[in-house]
Amino acid sequence: SGVFQLQLQEFINERGVLASGRPCEPGCRTFFRVCLKHFQAVVSPGPCTFGTVSTPVLGTNSFAVRDDSSGGGRNPLQLPFNFTWPGTFSLIIEAWHAPGDDLRPEALPPDALISKIAIQGSLAVGQNWLLDEQTSTLTRLRYSYRVICSDNYYGDNCSRLCKKRNDHFGHYVCQPDGNLSCLPGWTGEYCQQPICLSGCHEQNGYCSKPAECLCRPGWQGRLCNECIPHNGCRHGTCSTPWQCTCDEGWGGLFCDQDLNYCTHHSPCKNGATCSNSGQRSYTCTCRPGYTGVDCELELSECDSNPCRNGGSCKDQEDGYHCLCPPGYYGLHCEHSTLSCADSPCFNGGSCRERNQGANYACECPPNFTGSNCEKKVDRCTSNPCANGGQCLNRGPSRMCRCRPGFTGTYCELHVSDCARNPCAHGGTCHDLENGLMCTCPAGFSGRRCEVRTSIDACASSPCFNRATCYTDLSTDTFVCNCPYGFVGSRCEFPVGLPPSFPW
């Protein structure tokens, strides 16, 4: 489909005569009829197979024809065709005189013809005008012509239909030859396929519009090149979707079990050494001077009760100092100032001189103990029950009542979080569903009974016979410093008078 365009430029009829030689009265009011047809070697009358067109009266005798394409579109003349342009044509242009206003052929006298020209030849489709001039005896016509394709038709013969579009069916404009030229971001035969974001993974990503990257199931990331691990995967990665491969130090199906608690949490304090002991558990080996599950508690040197014979221990910057009760001396109150002459052994104990009578030792009868045989033997004194077990005297034997989470004859086997004796200062450990709780003895508080809240053990005036009372800060018990002539843990016994014990 296209248009044959004919641009009339100038018509010369100086004498104002018709083809017959007769002059026009008053002048030749000239209009044109154009016939376009298929190529003929000799142009002959007959049907105008490619089309016809007529002009109105354009002038009288000689005149130039104004380019009127912008106004009404009458010059150039348009001869549209709805077929493939064959490349050849025949053209007949007739100039006629119009005596009146009726320009129909049947309304004109037969001798109203002014001139007739006929040309034929080949003509390629193109934008360029071909200029021609035809002269007869009395007239001259100057004109130009060309063939162009209609809108949306392209190619050498205007046979290629191409309509630019930007919708679901395609995104393109048309090239001069009628081929499609895709709009930016589109590709494919009909420019229907979007060009995805640069780098978007070919298999794992796709797009519905240009510069987009939508991920297929199991993939994520800007370029859809990262797999999605299995739902619930905690400390793991994947190489294909829905896997869960554990990071170093993690275990379990969902990599949620800490196999390296020491590295991940650094629980041990004060330079202690941490050892992993299975999932979510660890053991701290404390440096000297520290205690507690995490070695968080600083040990007092008095905690080991180094003072003997009722001596009171005092912490000092460079160690400790024992305050000895009357009758004892030495670094640990281990030496006695009494001798066997003072009858220091109670409850039938036998006195033996030592160091040439400088001190003595008591040999106690069964069921009595102490440096002066002053204490009844408590089979629980040695505290045989581990892990805070309660020792019960049962006649000649003893038994241990274990705290929750411990078992065995001496409560030495642990079955719970309380196994590591996390509660300081004799605190009682209780297993809870997710942890433990310490019940602290009088004088201590804190999560692990590590905070001392001092109690004055002397407040109840336990010492007799005007003895001086000292509070032992390490055990929150008292020590009585006896005046001369009295002995016993409360200075209740006069020296030389064996007491009568109620048991």
Epitope: H230, C233, G236, Q243, C244, T245, C246, W250, G251, G252, L253, F254, C255
Partner: nanobody, 120 residues
Framework: EVQLVESGGGLVQPGGSLRLSCTAS????????IGWFRQAPGKEPEGISC????????YYADSVKGRFTTSRDSAKNTVYLQMNSLKPEDTAVYYC?????????????WGQGTQVTVSS
Amino acid sequence: EVQLVESGGGLVQPGGSLRLSCTASGFTFDVYAIGWFRQAPGKEPEGISCISSSGSITYYADSVKGRFTTSRDSAKNTVYLQMNSLKPEDTAVYYCATPGIAACRGIHYWGQGTQVTVSS
């Protein structure tokens, strides 16, 4: 192709027992750890037990410790999950899974699952 097929699920009353089986194929059974995880509607999956390739190392989630037991039978290429003292909160789809290695460290393959419903 690695395949894990679970069976043995069903409806059971609270306090009751069930034994789930997981039959494996497509790989050398003795070289992979195999475990169980479960997923209740609207919840994240929970790893409940896993037994190493040798059968010597087995771990259990706190929620099932003392009630569930995992064992493996190499002759039958099967892993079992014995579930006792079942509670309503044990209701879930139970899946058999393997990390594709000897240790219980991750998931690479898993089965279609078997439904366990604990209700009176």
